[in-house]
Interface confidence: low
């Protein structure tokens, strides 16, 4: 037999055995030019010493073979003895180590068997009624196709599915959508209406995320407030990466989950903008305010679940950086100013009412005064901080008040509102004998002591009613008792207590009279 022809003789080996795991696979034959044809196949197993024979049986029942040696591809013309206009059956027999292995057969009309291309270029992916819809442009001159898909997840092997017949300039396929795992899809095509014709190669992988993006499991830590009144939010634990099928593990587009950080500044609600969304990689600076931080995961199908954290306000208070002066016209606060043209937000709230909304005031952009101070004033009629109770005051600053991440904390402190001098007067002053020449003076804590850092000291005054001599004794703000010594028996004394703040002298308590009894010896 001539090598260019199909040899109508028995092949030079014994009968084939098709039961082997190795051997020839995936035979496909098609027309490559007006009179030229090609068959190709895969061979699984050791290739050393393997000889391949392409077998062909005509509809008349006559059979022939091409010997291809070690090659797994053969080209032949319509003059090679194989009928190209009628149906033929083709298969491959591979002879090795005294045994023959046989491929599955294909039955086709070679003349009509055009090599179809898989979907090329951009495959659009969308969600339709809980299913996945893929759509692509039909390759040139190949309208009319049968389409199959195969898909796998990170933990499963390939599963095959049918897209059905296609007969348009665009082709599409409905496929199953997984809720919680990523999938890899591939598509292939063959000519419509020619059952025995060969399938195209599989398309490039189409990587599809799960319908639900994963819950973002991340952890934050927030640094201490710096001297600039800001603290950096830091990601302690990156979101866990989605497990991907094998073909999607490179830079495969379409499967990626993006994470965004949604920042909501809870303090200072009167400012222009309370919420900002930014990429998770861009960890922002925060002021010392309280924030809610949400991490939102989204993929090509839209947003998924989010995870929310509360970042509490920085409770560190400044040692009296705030000066408050109360005059007949009203009250003015002074504090060390920031740069030129800074907007300040002054917020206050009665201590113990943290759940309720704070009072908030935004200043117009202001420059430092000649003493380098910034100010905020209000009239007595406004009633602001007018009640005799402890208020927590926080002042924030920003040169760009509309940019949420550019606010910083200027100070955080406490202030006792209303008439602090009177309200802070200690009550329940009592005197007890201590020894022959001393007494113990006790009093109930001043209301000012409920306000951290406000009460500077107590002063106890003792007056000798005989000589009108007066002595004053400073007492630490944490103490509510003092011992008065060197007193004389039989003399009348009055004792009073007052509570002082850093900027205000308190009012004296009601005078208490006492004397030490003269001891009569037997």
């Amino acid at each position: 037999c001539r090598t260019s022809e199909c040899c109508f003789q028995d092949p030079p080996y014994s009968d084939a055995d098709s039961g082997s795991a190795s051997g020839p696979r995936d035979l496909s034959c098609y027309r490559i030019s007006s009179a030229g044809y090609e068959c190709s196949w895969q061979y699984e197993g050791p290739t050393a010493g393997v000889s391949h024979f392409l077998r062909c049986c005509l509809s008349s029942g006559r059979c022939c073979y091409f010997a291809t040696g070690s090659a797994t591809r053969l080209q032949f013309s319509d003059q090679a003895g194989v009928s190209v206009l009628h149906t033929v059956t083709l298969w491959v027999e591979s002879w090795a180590r005294n045994r023959t292995e046989k491929s599955p057969e294909v039955t086709l009309q070679l003349y009509k068997s055009v090599k179809y291309k898989p979907p090329l270029g951009d495959i659009k992916v969308s969600k339709l009624a809980g299913q996945l819809r893929m759509e692509w442009e039909t390759p040139d001159n190949q309208v009319g196709a049968e389409v199959q898909f195969r898909h796998r997840t990170p933990s499963s092997s390939w599963k095959l599915g049918d897209c059905g017949p296609q007969d348009d300039d665009t082709e599409s396929c409905l496929c199953p959508l997984e809720m919680n795992v990523a999938q890899e899809f591939q598509l292939r095509r063959r000519r419509l209406g020619s059952q025995g014709s060969s399938w195209s190669k599989w398309s490039s992988p189409v990587c599809v995320p799960p319908e639900n993006p994963p819950q973002p499991q991340v952890r934050f830590s927030v640094e201490q407030l710096g001297r600039d009144g800001r603290r950096r939010l830091t990601l302690k634990e990156q979101p866990t990466q989605l497990e991907l099928p094998e073909g999607c593990q490179g830079p495969a587009p379409g499967v990626e989950v993006t994470y965004q950080l949604q920042l909501h500044m809870l303090s200072c609600p009167c400012k222009a903008k309370a919420t900002r969304t930014l990429p998770l990689e861009k960890m922002p600076y925060l002021s010392g305010a309280a924030y809610n931080v949400a991490v939102i995961s989204s993929n090509r199908f839209g947003p998924g679940p989010n995870q929310t954290w509360h970042i509490p306000a920085d409770t560190h208070t400044e040692p009296v950086a705030l000066n408050i002066s109360v005059g007949t016209n009203g009250t003015t606060m002074y504090w060390p100013a920031r740069a030129q043209s800074t907007t300040y937000c002054i917020e206050w709230q009665p201590v113990g009412q943290e759940g309720s909304l704070a009072t908030c005031n935004l200043t117009a952009p202001q420059d430092p005064d000649p003493a380098g101070m910034a100010t905020y004033s209000w009239s007595r009629e406004s009633g602001a901080m007018g009640q005799e109770k402890c208020y927590h005051i926080t002042i924030f600053a920003s040169a760009h008040p509309k940019k949420l991440t550019l606010w910083s904390t200027v100070l955080s402190t406490y202030h006792f509102g209303g008439n602090a001098s009177a309200a802070g007067t200690p009550h329940h002053v009592s005197v007890k004998n201590h020894s022959l020449d001393s007494v113990s003076v006790d009093w109930a804590p001043s209301l000012l002591s409920t306000c951290p850092g406000v009460l500077k000291e107590y002063v106890v005054r003792c007056r000798d009613e005989d000589s009108n001599q007066v002595s004053e004794h400073p007492v630490q703000p944490t103490e509510t008792q003092v011992t008065l010594s060197d007193l004389r028996a039989g003399v009348a004394y009055t004792v009073q207590v007052r509570a002082d703040t850093a900027w205000l002298r308190g009012a004296w308590s009601q005078p208490q009279r006492f004397s030490i009894k003269v001891q009569v010896s037997d």
């Epitope: 201490q224 710096g226 001297r227 600039d228 830091t234 990429p279 861009k282 040169a399 550019l406």
Partner: antibody
């Protein structure tokens, strides 16, 4: 005026460590983050990470994680960058750069320190 | 990582000319973009931050514009001291990345 003055050039053997210092003056050291950037001979600039001098907090580029350590000594207003397990491709000029207040851009740079890694 | 590309990679111009350098980010970075000038053997010098804000002390002949992925640096009325390498840098997403640089040479 703001100045960042870096330590002098060093020659190191492969596998050794190099520690570069950056002394700040003309501003409050603890108020501004400091970043480190390097530049191989004839090449572009590569960001390595930052340190917050206020509390010592750091963030390193993934590429240098495990090999770089950034520290500071607030008493002398100085930041340090130590790179360990040096290779020949670590030969570069190492710069410190100050981050502006209110944005994470850089405003002032040190003059640079050449570290040469050669056997 | 975000890739930053600059064009042209080098450019010849004469004293007095006006030139424009472009910088492109591989994904949107808002306005988190800075420009630096580096003269031979010297440290980089900061020119522009937030895409268009001039660093203090930098002459107004330097201007920047752009947002998202495309940015430009314009230098008007070139002087001999302006011939140097210019780098762009994004500081929106870690790791911060720089463009490869544009060498501005005297024609």
């Amino acid at each position: 005026q703001v100045q960042l003055v870096q330590s002098g050039a060093e020659v190191k053997k492969p596998g050794a460590s190099a520690k570069v210092s950056c002394k700040a003056s003309g501003y409050t050291f603890t108020d501004y983050y400091l970043h480190w950037v390097r530049q191989a001979p004839g090449q572009g600039l590569e960001w390595m990470g930052w340190i917050n001098p206020n509390n010592g907090g750091t963030h390193y580029a993934q590429k240098f994680q495990g090999r770089v350590t950034m520290t500071r000594d607030t008493s002398i207003s100085t930041a340090y960058m130590e790179l360990s397990r040096l290779r020949s491709d670590d030969t570069a000029v190492y710069y410190c750069a100050r981050e502006m207040g209110g944005t994470t851009a850089f405003d002032y740079w040190g003059q640079g320190t050449l570290v040469t890694v050669s056997s | 990582d975000i890739q930053m590309t600059q064009s042209p990679s080098s450019l010849s111009a004469s004293v007095g000319d006006r030139v424009t350098i472009t910088c492109r980010a591989s994904q949107g970075i808002g306005n988190y973009l800075a420009w630096f000038q580096q003269r031979p053997g010297k440290a980089p010098k900061s020119l522009i931050y937030a895409a268009s804000s001039l660093q203090s002390g930098v002459p107004s002949k330097f201007s920047g514009s752009g947002s998202g992925t495309d940015f430009t640096l314009t230098i008007s009325s070139l002087q001999p001291a302006d011939f140097a390498i210019y780098y762009c840098q994004q500081y929106n997403i870690y790791p911060y990345t720089f463009g490869p640089g544009t060498r501005l040479e005297i024609k």
